[in-house]
Structures are given as C-alpha cells and as structure tokens.
Interface confidence: medium
Amino acid sequence: GITNINCSGHIWVEPATIFKMGMNISIYCQAAIKNCQPRKLHFYKNGIKERFQITRINKTTARLWYKNFLEPHASMYCTAECPKHFQETLICGKDISSGYPPDIPDEVTCVIYEYSGNMTCTWNAGKLTYIDTKYVVHVKSLETEEEQQYLTSSYINISTDSLQGGKKYLVWVQAANALGMEESKQLQIHLDDIVIPSAAVISRAETINATVPKTIIYWDSQTTIEKVSCEMRYKATTNQTWNVKEFDTNFTYVQQSEFYLEPNIKYVFQVRCQETGKRYWQPWSSLFFHKTPETVPQVTSKAFQHDTWNSGLTVASISTGHLTSDNRGDIG
C-alpha cells in the first residue's frame, strides 16, 4: 500500500486514520526535505490533486479539510514544490478508511448439517461496516463450564470433534472493529436438536394417463435419521402462490408422492426436510420443473449435475440444469 513509501516528512489524520463515515476530517502534511523551503504543499486523493479546503499552517505544514467524508477507502499523499526542483517532491502517504462500528449481532443460529462433521454458526451482522470487522464466537459447555473462542470474519465451522463438553452449550458472538465492539445475546443449544438431515433431492417425475391423470414425484435423501418430516411445495410457474404438502418420511427407499395436477401446465416443485420435532429445516431443494401432458404420459428427470433414471414410457425429457431455489438460506 501507500504506507510503504519512503517519506520526507509526515502525514497524519485527525481524528484518526480509521473514522466514522460522514465525519469531518483533517489531513495534515508536514515536510522535512533537505534544502527545501516548500513554496507550496499539495494533497492528492487516489492520485487526483485536491484544489480546495487546503490551509497553510506554517512554513512546513498544511492542512486539508473534508466535510462529511463518505468514501470507505482512500489513498492520500502530499507533495512539496521545492525551489530549484522541476518536479514536486513526495513527502508522505497514508491509506485512510471510514466506516461504522458493528451492530449487535443477532439471529445467532448453529446447525449441524448431517455428514458435515461441523457445527455451522451464522448470525445477522447488521449493516455493512465498510472496515475490517472481526467476530469472536464463544462456545461454552453448560456441563463442564469450559469455554472455547473462535475468531472469524463471517460465519464459523466448528468441528463436532472439538465439542467435547457434552451436548449442551451456550453460544454468543462478539463483533469488533476499530470503531467499536458489540455482543450478541446467548443462544442455548443441544447438539441433538440442531442436526439438519442430508439434502433431499427430487430426481424425476412422471404423469400417468389414467381416468384422472396423476403425477408421481420421485425423491430421496441419504439421511440416516429415522424420523424425518418433509414439505414439498409446488405451483404452476405462472402462479405466485405455493401449495404445500407435508410428509412423515422414512428414507429407506425412494419416496413417491402423488399429485393431481391440471393438464398441459408447467409446474415447479421443491422439497425440504427436518428431523421430526426439531427446529431447523433444510434449505429448499433445487427447482424441479415438470410439464403435465395434454393426454400422453410424460416423464421428467433431474439430478444435480447428473442425469438420472427415467422410465421407458412414451414421452420423456431430461432436465439437467442446476437451478438454485429462491431462498436457499431458509433454515428457520
């Protein structure tokens, strides 16, 4: 950065190099150049010479004043016009930053995604601070009273192997930057209550042409959790409102769910599951599209980036695009 340059003087910022966005600030430049009584002192911001609000304080020092400074980062340097020098002489430079103190972290959430081997903790950090903000996640065992701390810039993955203090913990988050520090409320967790089952996947759909045409959605999960509750939501792609069907599921075989849908309409399906009676849901699965036929039977098939099985019925189509859901982060 600009702070690494060789200086022939001094540059400093009041109230500080990192300050609250919107403040009035002063940048001072003091020359200390051999055999030079500066005729003029110049300030540059991000390489552009400043023309206004410069005050000469004495023979070697000048001040640049900014009202309501709103830029998150700027590189400042100052130069001197020395007699008998054709070019301006560099005095010194400094990187300055403006931002906000952190908000109180809220909505602290910790989950264990099945098979991940980690407890993932997230929180709402509040408004953007614009400056380097660190978070310390405190995890305290309610059984042993032992506390562990983890430093991070965003969320944190904590290996479940490191959670040796039983099943019950308190978790809270401290946010800190150069402008302030805040602490969240404490979240009490039980490790058995925060497991989210392995993702459910809709793999294919078929419409059977009976007296009343019936669409069967095939879906599965690799979860080993025995009691799982799932929701499948579906709607015509032209509609805003979702219909939701609930299922109590045992994933020892491929699930088949039946729907009676309107003919010749494109529908979209998503599924999500949770361990029965627990708090957190999976994110909704990828969007799965299926167009119901006018009369003939139809099969649609999809797996993440892979093709998957489809039956030998007369009309078949494969959809392999990976379309993410409209709210993948919804685990509450």
Partner: nanobody, 124 residues
C-alpha cells in the same frame, strides 16, 4: 422386472483402460442405488463403486480410488465404470447391481438385482 445387462469387459495389458456399461430395464428407476461389484476366482464378491442416482453421489473401494470412476446417463438408463491404470489384481468378473432399499453401501448383500457379469482380464 428389473434387468441389468453389462458390457465392455475384455482383456487388457496392465496400465490400460476399459469402460464397462450397465444398461438397466425401465423398472430400475425405482432402485435407490446402483453399483459395480467384482468377484475373482476363489474369492468373495466385493464392492467396487456405487452411485446414488438421485444426486450423483459416489462411493469407491479404497483399492480403486483415483483409478476407477462410476457415472450415469439417465437418458440411456445406463451406469458406467471407467477403469484406468488397470492392474493384474483387478482381474475378475464384474457385476452391475441395483439396490431398491438401504444405504450407499459396498456390501453385496444390500443389493437386490444383479446382472450376469462381464469378464475383465488384466495381464502383466
């Protein structure tokens, strides 16, 4: 009725490659897992690789990791086993199998449906 038909076996020199295919009858789409297994003369049948058709997740035996790749083509209702850097100890009858229930296991007893097998011979 679920039917599985393997092809692609043959003889190859050590270090060579083969690609096995397993074509499934329409009924196989209800299977939860598909897998490749092998049986050398005088030895028990062992798991090589399995795939979860819904999501494409795969599991490999330690002895073939990094050399063999299991994949699928849903449109053709086919599972493949790409075998690279073959060794003489890979010589065996290779079977395709489908499991209607259960987990992604390399244990043969969890699989309900079996093909007739295709012979792979690797000479040094």
């Amino acid at each position: 009725q679920v039917q599985l038909q393997e092809s692609g076996g043959g003889s190859v020199q050590a270090g060579g490659s083969l690609r096995l295919s397993c074509a499934a009858s329409p009924g196989t789409y209800t299977s939860r897992y598909m897998g490749w297994f092998r049986q050398a003369p005088g030895k028990e049948r062992e798991g090589v690789a399995t795939i979860w058709p819904a999501g494409g997740n795969t599991v490999y035996a330690d002895s073939v990791k990094g050399r063999f790749t299991i994949s699928q083509d849903g449109a053709k209702k086919t599972v493949y086993l790409q075998m690279n850097s073959l060794k003489p100890e890979d010589t065996a009858m290779y079977y395709c199998a489908a499991a209607k229930y259960g987990g992604t296991s390399l244990a043969p007893y969890t699989y309900n449906y079996w093909g007739q097998g295709t012979q792979v011979t690797v000479s040094s």
